[in-house]
Every structure is written in structure tokens, then in C-alpha cells.
Amino acid sequence: VQNSCDNCQPGTFCRKYNPVCKSCPPSTFSSIGGQPNCNICRVCAGYFRFKKFCSSTHNAECECIEGFHCLGPQCTRCEKDCRPGQELTKQGCKTCSLGTFNDQNGTGVCRPWTNCSLDGRSVLKTGTTEKDVVCGPPVVSFSPSTTISVTPEGGPGGHSLQVL
């Protein structure tokens, strides 16, 4: 029988008025030895499921069930996964701002629409919060002395077109 709580290991508790290391009772844990009480284990239920079960030395860890994601430190809340057109922020699901989109369900961030003009293309279809813009074919910019060779399908022969 010891006379101090100082040497108690994690997974135990100890009372100053009766300084003996006692094992934590069922469904409790103590990550630091020598404390006057063990802590009640977290229970993962409802929208939560166990990521890690409770032991006498560590609390349980929870994660959210399919279709939900964690919010807050140590996954204190579960929120429905974000829809396409939204992204997950610290405040929860937020709609993508104008000029950005997210086409993924539950994950991903809002990304800027493709800038078609950087590729020398026109916008064929405007973007939405859920979909990127659709760029058209390259815009042909004609300059003098450009020769375009046109070869009809199925024939070796070609026509030469001189653009002045």
C-alpha cells in the first residue's frame, strides 16, 4: 500500500484521504494517473460512430456516419455532407461564391471557373455553382499570309486557300 498518489499510472484514480491507486471503473478513463476521479467515456451514438473505443487510459473518439461530416474540436457535432455547389467551412456548408463551383458531393472546395480566354477559347456554356464553364473551340485569329490547307475526307487531293 503506497502513501502517495504521485506514483499512480494512467488508468487509475487516487484519493488523498485514502492514497491508493484504484483502477478506473467500467466506462471511465484517466489519461493522467493520481487524479481524484476518472472521466466518463464518450459514447458515440446517433449520427456518431466509434472511430476509437474507450480504454482505461484514453477516451473514445467519434466520427460521423456516412453522409455526415464532423464539426468542432474532437468532432463534437455532425452535419449533413455538403451538396454540389457548396463547400465546407468552419461555419458549416456554404454556397460557392459567384465565379466558383464545386461539382463534388460531400467533399471538395469551391474552385474558380476556367478562364476560357486564357486558352484563346470562347465560353460555350456559362458556369454555375455546381458546374464549371464549358469553353468553345479556339477562336481563330486570321493574319495575312496564312495558308490554310483543307483536305477533304477520303481524298488525297487538297485545295490551297490563300488569305490576303
Epitope: R15, K16, N18, C24, P25, T28, N37, C38, I40
Partner: antibody, heavy 124, light 106 residues
Framework: EMQLVESGGGLVQPGRSMKLSCAGS????????VAWVRQAPKKGLEWVAY????????YYRESVKGRFTISRDNAKSTLYLQMDSLRSEDTATYYC?????????????????WGPGTMVTVSS | DIQMTQSPSLLSASVGDRVTLNCRTS??????LAWYQQQLGEAPKLLIY???SLQAGIPSRFSGSGSGTDFTLTISSLQPEDVATYFC????????FGAGTNLELK
């Protein structure tokens, strides 16, 4: 020396009130869940009321609900039992005792440290 | 509420005897059972918790056994200072004490 000392007992008329105190010394009473357990003359033991270590949770046995109030002042390391509308069947020695279970729990208590008790007599 | 039955209610024994006290609960309490000793004019003292764990400072002649609904407190060699009333208490569902066993010397 570590001890619990109850005070405030005595003779009281039925229907009247009385407040018991329990002072802890030599250790930190605020670390523990604490209960009042009573014992009628020449009878068995009966748990009366419980308060969690921080004071946020209280439990009462059915026969005292609405009449007794358990509270604590952690700064003064003191526990209280306010007893109103007293009845003759409340006559007993009242013990202040610490919950030894060790789980910050409101459901499993055994009592591993007791005060000497204070006698409460309800009689006209 | 869980009912507690202690037997016998009165027990006479001699110094040096092996003494057995019984406690039965009306439903399964697993190992959530404690034993207390109360000497005349004194507060109760915890002897055993979790059915068989000896409280620090209690002589090793005291031992507890049992699980479920039937429990036993054994004093391996009775000493004069063991004369007292012994109570069992379940703490599985609420808290209930037995009526006690009064242990006296023959």
C-alpha cells in the same frame, strides 16, 4: 488530519426547517461527489441525497424530493443539506460521506469516507 | 428498487472463528456491491468494494466474494474488535443497503 465534520443537527418540530453543514478539512472536498446518508435510531442505512463534484448534478431519494436540497460551496469546502417540511420519519443520524466510485458518476456510489454524523430529532 | 437480504440478522461467534456473512440482491448487480462495518456509536467504515476489493487500511482477515445476486463477507479469524454490525450495499441501480448483520462474541 483529514476529516469531515457535520453540524446543525438538533431537535426540531414537524413541519419546520433545518440546515445541516458538512465541513471538509485536510483535503479538497470539491474534488469529490458527496452524499448524505441517514440512519434512524437502531435501524439501517439510507441514502438521502447526492451532489456531483462540481455541484451541477443532484439526486434525491423519493421520500425527500421537493423537501430537501443538497448544495455545496467549494470555496468554503462545505456541503449543505437544507431540510424543509420535516416529518417524524426524518428523525435520524445524518452522515456526510464521499463517493468512492471514482467515475464522476451519478449512478454508482459507494461511500469510502464518512463524518461522525449529526443527530436530527423531529418531534413536537 | 433492488431489495437486499442479509443473513443471518444476528450471529454469535468466538474469537478465532471463521465467520461468514451473506447478502442477497433481488436482481443481478454484477460486482457492484460494498460491505461496511459499523461499531457501536460510530460511523460506518468501508471494508470491501466491487464485491471483492479490500479497502486500504482494512485488515487482510476480511475478504469479499460473489457476483450477480449472492455475496459473502468472510472474516478468517474473528478478533474482539470485529464485534459490530455489518451492512452490504448495492450500487448497480440506485443505492440500497441491507438491514445488517449484528455480529457478537459468544
Amino acid at each position: 488530519e483529514m476529516q469531515l465534520v457535520e453540524s446543525g443537527g438538533g431537535l426540531v418540530q414537524p413541519g419546520r426547517s433545518m440546515k445541516l453543514s458538512c465541513a471538509g478539512s485536510g483535503f479538497t472536498l470539491s474534488d469529490y461527489g458527496v452524499a448524505w446518508v441517514r440512519q434512524a435510531p437502531k435501524k439501517g442505512l439510507e441514502w438521502v441525497a447526492y451532489i456531483s463534484y462540481a455541484g451541477g448534478t443532484t439526486y434525491y431519494r423519493e421520500s425527500v424530493k421537493g423537501r430537501f436540497t443538497i448544495s455545496r460551496d467549494n470555496a468554503k469546502s462545505t456541503l449543505y443539506l437544507q431540510m424543509d417540511s420535516l416529518r417524524s420519519e426524518d428523525t435520524a443520524t445524518y452522515y456526510c460521506t464521499i463517493d468512492g466510485y471514482g467515475g464522476y458518476s451519478g449512478s454508482h456510489w459507494y461511500f469510502d469516507f464518512w463524518g461522525p454524523g449529526t443527530m436530527v430529532t423531529v418531534s413536537s | 428498487d433492488i431489495q437486499m437480504t442479509q443473513s443471518p440478522s444476528l450471529l454469535s461467534a468466538s474469537v478465532g472463528d471463521r465467520v461468514t456473512l451473506n447478502c442477497r440482491t433481488s436482481q443481478n448487480v454484477y460486482k457492484n456491491l460494498a460491505w461496511y462495518q459499523q461499531q457501536l456509536g460510530e460511523a460506518p467504515k468501508l471494508l470491501i468494494y466491487n464485491a471483492n476489493s479490500l479497502q486500504a487500511g482494512i485488515p487482510s482477515r476480511f475478504s469479499g466474494s460473489g457476483s450477480g445476486t449472492d455475496f459473502t463477507l468472510t472474516i478468517s479469524s474473528l478478533q474482539p474488535e470485529d464485534v459490530a454490525t455489518y451492512f452490504c450495499q448495492q450500487y448497480y441501480s440506485g443505492n440500497t443497503f441491507g438491514a445488517g448483520t449484528n455480529l457478537e462474541l459468544k
